[in-house]
């Protein structure tokens, strides 16, 4: 059993069919030393009698918040929540697998630049009952400071039958170095709670690994005098980090046609524009990367050839 | 090219070969995050490889203030990729075959360290830890582990020079 | 993009020779080696060994030294597989293929096959 | 050489069934190996590379496992366009070899 914060308490109990599960031994805060009686939740039914109450937790049933009363008043309150460990694996019922980069991907995280600053984000199922709380930092052993708001809901999609939530956090680190080369990843660890069940979820990752730059912007076109073809140009996305002679991009610029089974002309380029041929009712598109590094590619920024 | 003394590198140079060797250190290894390495066993580490790190004055004010700083820093760091590319981690099992991109990374590492340091000149260099695996599955780790920290080294350095060549050459 | 035409099928007698041609297009061809394998009817695949067309150098299976010589012509981009001494057991379906860029011998692009039958 | 030891050499399964085809080397590969997947008349085609990832545009019921020498292809569920043959190979050492394959039929 360890703290979870003040009075709330997680159980850490193997989880199998006829599990002898975990003695607990919850103490009352209070000086008092008699007539002290224990009750769970709501119910008026007393548990036992003194400053110290044992308890067997096996089950949900055993979890809950535990309060000591003395004479009608209340005098401490111990939540229980239970992490449930099945055949050596902690369980992970609370948020969905995004499979994507790989399998167990719960978390998945996000950065526009080399600043510090990041977005993870996770997806549920469960509409109530939840809480997240997010911490991080840069490193393990001697770790770092990263500074992490709340977790908000920030999407609800419809995935079939299903309700699917999307929370996400923002996180920055507390002394950011964007022009040096990271050694030691930053870390994100989730507490899940719904209901009685807790659950913890963690992310691993270098932040040149999660970069995303948004999409080129005021991408333009400009026919070219008796030709089919048009240059192209754009900008580095307000977002991306400075100066970028050093922190430099690179895009891939592509003519689609109407039909997606036309064939795609791709160009690769590291300036800011570009000759194509603009076919009729195609569409040019055109999105970056880290010119040195590959990671992410942005989105589409598009315009119609018309 | 850059001395100790302090004269300047030809950047456009180092520019153009640090761009190849990005290409190169991700033809070499393309993976991303193919098997978290970070949880693979780490008896023999890469810990020692020489980081560029937020004192090594390879931002684009340190750059400014005295490029020599940081352009020792990728110096030693090419010396230490190039001994480690030329070691029996990448000559052994998992047998490489002739076309592959570690050889001509290793030949690209060692010209653009003596771009910046040409003969007669010595900057330190950092001691290369004795890494001999003997299993195919240590060698392989190591490879792996090595091609994704130079890919981030280079990736710094290539910035170095691409700052450099737009904002320092003469 | 890349491709491996493959020369057609042979039918040959025992003792004698023939020579599969493999014209690759879409990639520098002295930049990647060519691999050669084969597959006996209703048979898992053997490696036979490759040649880098950059130096000319081959390298062979044991298994196949003295009975195969892999060779390149740079000016026509095209890989040539010849087997001597033709027995019944080398009917096959002969593939060149090449391999991914990173180094390995991860086969990802194919020539159609040849198909060789030794037959009295 | 280095011996790939492939099981089962033919299956039949049924469609949305889990299948699973096991390779053994001889000795440490690490996890350099790959699996193809051959259908009738056609040529091998790249579906995993180091033991578990997953080739380009590969569907992700396709799944690899293993390291050093035991090594598994997972279909997690079956589709009748997977009838074919699979074939394991090793690419840690010359000679490179690859298993004897695994006959994949619908029931």
């Known amino acids: 059993i360890w703290e979870l914060k003040k009075d709330v308490y997680v159980v850490e109990l193997d989880w199998y069919p006829d599990a002898p599960g975990e003695m607990v031994v919850l103490t009352c805060d209070t000086p008092e030393e008699d007539g002290i009686t224990w009750t769970l939740d709501q119910s008026s039914e007393v548990l036992g009698s003194g400053k110290t109450l044992t308890i067997q937790v096996k089950e949900f049933g055993d979890a809950g918040q535990y309060t000591c009363h003395k004479g009608g008043e209340v005098l401490s309150h111990s939540l229980l929540l239970l992490h449930k460990k099945e055949d050596g694996i902690w369980s992970t019922d609370i948020l969905k697998d995004q499979k994507e980069p790989k399998n167990k991907t719960f978390l998945r995280c996000e950065a526009k630049n080399y600043s510090g600053r990041f977005t993870c984000w996770w997806l549920t199922t469960i509409s109530t009952d939840l809480t997240f709380s997010v911490k991080s930092s840069r490193g393990s052993s001697d770790p770092q400071g990263v500074t992490c708001g709340a977790a908000t809901l920030s999407a609800e999609r419809v995935r079939g039958d299903n309700k699917e939530y999307e929370y996400s956090v923002e996180c920055q680190e507390d002394s950011a170095c964007p022009a040096a080369e990271e050694s030691l990843p930053i870390e994100v660890m989730v507490d899940a709670v719904h209901k009685l069940k807790y659950e913890n979820y963690t992310s691993s990752f270098f932040i040149r690994d999660i970069i995303k730059p948004d999409p080129p912007k005021n991408l333009q076109l400009k026919p070219l005098k008796n030709s089919r073809q048009v240059e192209v140009s754009w900008e580095y996305p307000d977002t991306w980090s400075t100066p970028h002679s050093y922190f430099s991009l690179t895009f891939c610029v592509q003519v689609q046609g109407k039909s997606k089974r036309e064939k795609k002309d791709r160009v690769f380029t590291d300036k800011t524009s570009a000759t194509v041929i603009c076919r009729k009712n195609a569409s040019i598109s055109v999105r970056a990367q880290d010119r040195y590094y590959s990671s992410s590619w942005s989105e589409w920024a598009s315009v119609p050839c018309s | 090219r850059a001395v100790p003394g302090g004269s300047s590198p030809a950047w456009t140079q180092c520019q153009q070969l640090s761009q190849k060797l990005c290409t190169l250190a991700w033809s070499a290894h393309p993976l991303v995050g193919h098997m978290d390495l970070r949880e693979e066993g780490d008896e023999e580490t890469t810990n020692d490889v020489p980081h560029i790190q937020c004192g090594d004055g390879c931002d684009p004010q340190g750059l400014r203030d005295n490029s020599q700083f940081c352009l020792q820093r990728i110096h030693q760091g090419l010396i230490f990729y190039e001994k480690l590319l030329g070691s029996d981690i990448f000559t052994g099992e998992p047998s490489l075959l002739p076309d592959s991109p570690v050889g001509q990374l290793h030949a690209s590492l060692l010209g653009l360290s003596q771009l910046l340091q040409p003969e007669g000149h010595h900057w330190e260099t950092q001691q290369i830890p004795s890494l001999s695996p003997s299993q195919p599955w240590q060698r392989l780790l190591l490879r792996f582990k090595i091609l994704r920290s130079l890919q981030a080294f280079v990736a710094v350095a290539a910035r170095v020079f691409a700052h450099g060549a737009a904002t320092l050459s003469p | 993009q890349v491709q491996l035409v493959q020369s057609g099928a042979e039918v040959k007698k025992p003792g004698s020779s023939v020579k599969v041609s493999c014209k690759a297009s879409?990639?520098?061809?002295?930049?990647?080696?060519i691999h050669w394998m084969r597959q006996a009817p209703g048979q898992g695949l053997e490696w036979i060994g490759y040649?880098?067309?950059?130096?000319?150098?081959?390298k062979y299976n044991e298994n196949f030294k003295g009975k195969v010589t892999i060779t390149a012509d740079k000016s026509t981009s095209t890989a040539y597989m010849e087997l001597s001494s033709l027995r019944s057991e080398d009917t096959a379906v002969y593939y060149c293929?090449?391999?991914?860029?990173?180094?390995?011998?991860?086969?990802?692009?194919w020539g159609q096959g040849t198909l060789v039958t030794v037959s009295s | 050489d280095i011996q790939m030891t492939q099981s089962p050499s033919s299956l039949s399964a049924s469609v949305g069934d889990r299948v699973t085809i096991t390779c053994k080397a001889s000795r440490d590969v690490a996890i350099a190996v790959a699996w193809y997947q051959q259908k009738p008349g056609k040529v091998p085609k790249l579906l995993i590379y180091w033991a578990s990832t997953r080739h380009t545009g590969v569907p992700s019921r396709f799944s690899g496992s293993g390291s050093r020498t035991d090594f598994t292809l997972t279909i997690s569920s079956l589709q009748p366009e997977d009838v074919a043959d699979y074939f394991c190979?090793?690419?840690?050492?010359?000679?490179?070899?690859f298993g004897s394959g695994t006959k994949l039929e619908i029931k």
């Open positions: 040649i880098y067309p950059r130096d000319d150098s081959p």
């Open positions: 190979h090793q690419y840690s050492s010359y000679p490179f070899t």
């Open positions: 879409g990639y520098t061809f002295t930049d990647q080696t």
């Open positions: 293929a090449i391999p991914d860029r990173s180094g390995y011998a991860l086969f990802i692009y």
